[in-house]
Interface confidence: low
């Protein structure tokens, strides 16, 4: 239904607090380098304007689209050309090209300083002095570093952030109360950002059909008792929500997400028996809870899939009449029966089924041609099962840090052209699959592991797309969304890679390493490991282990020394020489 003033409509639907927060997120995700104060000023101007439109929807400019209003506002930033370079050229365009242009300039890896957490007392004072500014700053800092963060979910994080400070700044031991909560929010936030980035990549790089297929599979696993028509309706609505958020239409996205949560709760009897608790919560918590809800139990006595999709003489007729609907039904039926499969595996099976029908329905005897289609699924199912089994065994044997190191070596040999920070970040995250998923029973391992790996490999793909350096990464990232993980798994050592020249500076360390946290120290060591492999791609596991053991002993020794800096200088030279000898450099 058309509204005379879109901005007034969204302001009334969302309320002033959410309206202001979402506009701030939108602006910070577009102009990631702008100072906080500039964004607050822009948001206040937009809010004041929205209020005039609420009072009189016929007032001047109130009929303009949100893209026009927001784009015009962003283009008033005086330093746009100096700060953003060619992004300023977006302002010469008309909508919708201008918004598309802003979207294309979103930076997944902005050159922003690391967020350093101040002392607890300092944070609590800032929180008490001006709670509103403190929380806005949180939204701003997260949004500019994560330009695709799911905006309505960020409101939920901000609510939890506020609750943590409200509770802990009154506690006897503020730090003991607050720090674990902030760590949890940080880790959950990074995971949420990465999951959403995959949804946006799916929509933007592979199109709506790819996203809808993903949603059919996931929702069918989660709501196996729901009818196909019900799942289809949820998929359509969910696709709209994510298309809006990924397209920068955050007000519409938040509004539509609230409507979807409302619909799900009003119709939970025909959707899932697991929604009751979620639906009793306030809006932000409710939406989050629904998104994370556990899979409902499978209906008893589901008939064999073969009857409708292999044995029936009407397979080709049904397929020809409505290809996507028929394939959607296949995916729905397969997914609801297989909560033990990853979504990407289900999508591979559906693709295999589609390819078979495309070929066979044009054959002389279609039924004879597709009769054995389910046999083709067996190797597709076994491949991730075997891979997860092997890697979980390795994880249990090595522990997380050494498992990450094994993956660092593996991936550096596959794609040595990728920058060292990216290889470290991605391999560390790949390695976390062990502690995240290997503890699960067999039936939950694959959906946990392979769908998590899809999220992590998408991080590699979006970081690599910014400055591509490897044809192999480009190929695995762009050819097929669902085959990314098998594509990377299948890569062998890159024999065309010319080893990096040995640079002693890369392996020079100083006393500051001693004051780093355990995590930061691990990252330093893992960075050195990647550089070693880039210098000596053919180094054996044993050679690399020997050098890394020497390195760990060297750091431990020098951090205990009285004159740490001299120790690092003297012993460091010896370490570099010994490493070169050990690796035959």
């Amino acid at each position: 239904d058309a509204h005379k003033s879109e901005v007034a409509h969204r302001f009334k639907d969302l309320g002033e607090e959410n309206f202001k927060a979402l506009v701030l997120i939108a602006f910070a995700q577009y102009l990631q380098q702008c100072p906080f104060e500039d964004h607050v000023k822009l948001v206040n101007e937009v809010t004041e304007f929205a209020k005039t439109c609420v009072a009189d929807e016929s007032a001047e400019n109130c009929d303009k689209s949100l893209h026009t209003l927001f784009g015009d506002k962003l283009c008033t930033v005086a330093t746009l050309r100096e700060t953003y370079g060619e992004m300023a050229d977006c302002c010469a365009k008309q909508e919708p090209e201008r918004n598309e242009c802003f979207l294309q300039h979103k930076d997944d890896n902005p050159n922003l300083p690391r967020l350093v957490r101040p002392e607890v007392d300092v944070m609590c004072t800032a929180f008490h002095d001006n709670e509103e500014t403190f929380l806005k700053k949180y939204l701003y800092e997260i949004a500019r570093r994560h330009p695709y963060f799911y905006a309505p979910e960020l409101l939920f994080f901000a609510k939890r952030y506020k609750a943590a400070f409200t509770e802990c700044c009154q506690a006897a031991d503020k730090a003991a109360c607050l720090l674990p909560k902030l760590d949890e929010l940080r880790d959950e936030g990074k995971a949420s950002s990465a999951k959403q980035r995959l949804k946006c990549a799916s929509l933007q790089k592979f199109g709506e059909r790819a996203f809808k297929a993903w949603a059919v599979a996931r929702l069918s696993q989660r709501f196996p008792k729901a009818e196909f028509a019900e799942v289809s309706k949820l998929v359509t609505d969910l696709t709209k929500v994510h298309t809006e958020c990924c397209h920068g239409d955050l007000l519409e996205c938040a509004d539509d997400r609230a409507d979807l949560a409302k619909y799900i709760c009003e119709n939970q009897d025909s959707i899932s028996s697991k929604l009751k608790e979620c639906c009793e919560k306030p809006l932000l918590e409710k939406s989050h809870c629904i998104a994370e809800v556990e899979n409902d139990e499978m209906p008893a006595d589901l008939p064999s899939l073969a009857a409708d999709f292999v044995e029936s003489k009407d397979v080709c007729k049904n397929y020809a009449e409505a290809k996507d609907v028929f394939l959607g039904m296949f995916l729905y039926e397969y997914a609801r029966r297989h909560p033990d499969y990853s979504v990407v595996l289900l999508l591979r099976l559906a693709k295999t089924y589609e390819t078979t029908l495309e070929k066979c329905c044009a054959a002389a005897d279609p039924h004879e041609c597709y009769a054995k289609v389910f046999d083709e699924f067996k190797p597709l199912v076994e491949e991730p099962q075997n891979l997860i089994k092997q890697n979980c065994e390795l994880f249990e044997q090595l522990g997380e840090y050494k498992f990450q190191n094994a993956l660092l070596v593996r991936y550096t040999k596959k794609v040595p052209q990728v920058s060292t920070p990216t290889l470290v970040e991605v391999s560390r995250n790949l390695g976390k699959v062990g502690s995240k998923c290997c503890k699960h029973p067999e039936a939950k391992r694959m959906p946990c592991a392979e769908d998590y790996l899809s999220v992590v490999l998408n991080q590699l793909c979006v970081l690599h797309e910014k400055t591509p350096v490897s044809d192999r990464v480009t190929k695995c990232c762009t050819e097929s969304l669902v085959n990314r993980r098998p594509c990377f798994s299948a890569l062998e050592v890159d024999e065309t890679y010319v080893p990096k020249e040995f640079n002693a500076e890369t392996f020079t360390f100083h006393a500051d390493i001693c004051t780093l946290s355990e995590k930061e120290r691990q990252i330093k060591k893992q960075t050195a490991l990647v550089e070693l492999v880039k210098h000596k791609p053919k180094a054996t596991k044993e050679q690399l282990k020997a050098v890394m053991d020497d390195f760990a002993a060297f750091v431990e020794k020098c951090c205990k020394a009285d004159d740490k800096e001299t120790c690092f200088a003297e012993e460091g030279k010896k370490l570099v020489a010994a490493s070169q000898a050990a690796l035959g450099l």
Partner: antibody, heavy 120, light 110 residues
Framework: EVQLVESGGGLVQPGGSLRLSCAAS????????MYWVRQAPGKGLEWVSV????????YYADSVKGRFTISRDNAKNTLYLQMNNLKSEDTAVYYC?????????????WGQGTQVTVSS | QPVLNQPPSVSGSPGQKFTISCTGS????????VNWYQHLPGTAPKLLIY???KRASGVPDRFSGSKSGTSASLTITELQAEDEADYYC???????????FGGGTRLTVL
């Protein structure tokens, strides 16, 4: 056979603008990074700009940043270079070149070039 | 001033073996592929060698490329009269986020 045909060059006064086009054929245009490279009289080759397959990523030489804009229309198989605030040192033959699937790939095919002269 | 350094000119006799050097830094040649181009006056430049060592299609096997650390070189065995041209090396530069060329080497066949 890969073909790249530049057009849009000519004589222009300092401070003026020109828009170069490069019509591509004989390959899947939308799959390749595309470049502009120029050669000033008596000088060597100088990279000007590059654009990725979708048009979402663009890079520019410092000498043209803020004045030149590279763009592409994959539906029309055409690469563009919008040149504003032209200076006499922009005088050169401008070549359009087909890159690889990644930014660091070699420039496998070049157009014949179009002359741009900036003079009062 | 070009980012990659090449000798401005070299000359040789037919049948000779010839090498043109190209020196850069870790942000370009050190961490990226090197490509070589041949440019004859009045024509479009032509890709000779890509990804350090691979010959572009149609390039005779008299031309070869190599890379070591932050330097690269183009070698022409059995120099021929038609090899007289300008030769450019090129690489992506991570710190400049751009493509860099050498200043070019004019090869004269005596």
């Amino acid at each position: 056979e890969v073909q790249l045909v530049e057009s849009g060059g000519g004589l222009v006064q300092p401070g003026g603008s020109l828009r170069l086009s490069c019509a591509a054929s004989g390959f899947t245009f939308s799959s390749y990074w595309m470049y502009w490279v120029r050669q000033a009289p008596g000088k060597g080759l100088e990279w000007v700009s590059v654009i990725n397959t979708s048009g979402g990523s663009t890079y520019y030489a410092d000498s043209v940043k803020g004045r030149f804009t590279i763009s592409r229309d994959n539906a029309k198989n055409t690469l563009y270079l919008q040149m504003n605030n032209l200076k006499s040192e922009d005088t050169a033959v401008y070549y359009c070149a087909k890159g690889g699937l990644v930014v660091a790939g070699g420039l496998g095919s070049w157009g014949q070039g179009t002359q741009v002269t900036v003079s009062s | 001033q070009p980012v990659l350094n090449q000798p401005p000119s070299v000359s040789g006799s037919p049948g000779q073996k010839f090498t043109i050097s190209c020196t850069g830094s870790s942000s370009n040649i050190g961490d990226n592929y090197v490509n070589w181009y041949q440019h004859l006056p009045g024509t479009a430049p032509k890709l000779l060698i890509y990804d350090n060592t691979k010959r572009a299609s149609g390039v005779p096997d008299r031309f070869s490329g190599s890379k070591s650390g932050t330097s690269a070189s183009l070698t022409i065995t059995e120099l021929q009269a038609e090899d007289e041209a300008d030769y450019y090396c090129s690489s992506w530069d991570d710190s400049l986020s751009g493509l860099v060329f050498g200043g070019g080497t004019r090869l004269t066949v005596l």
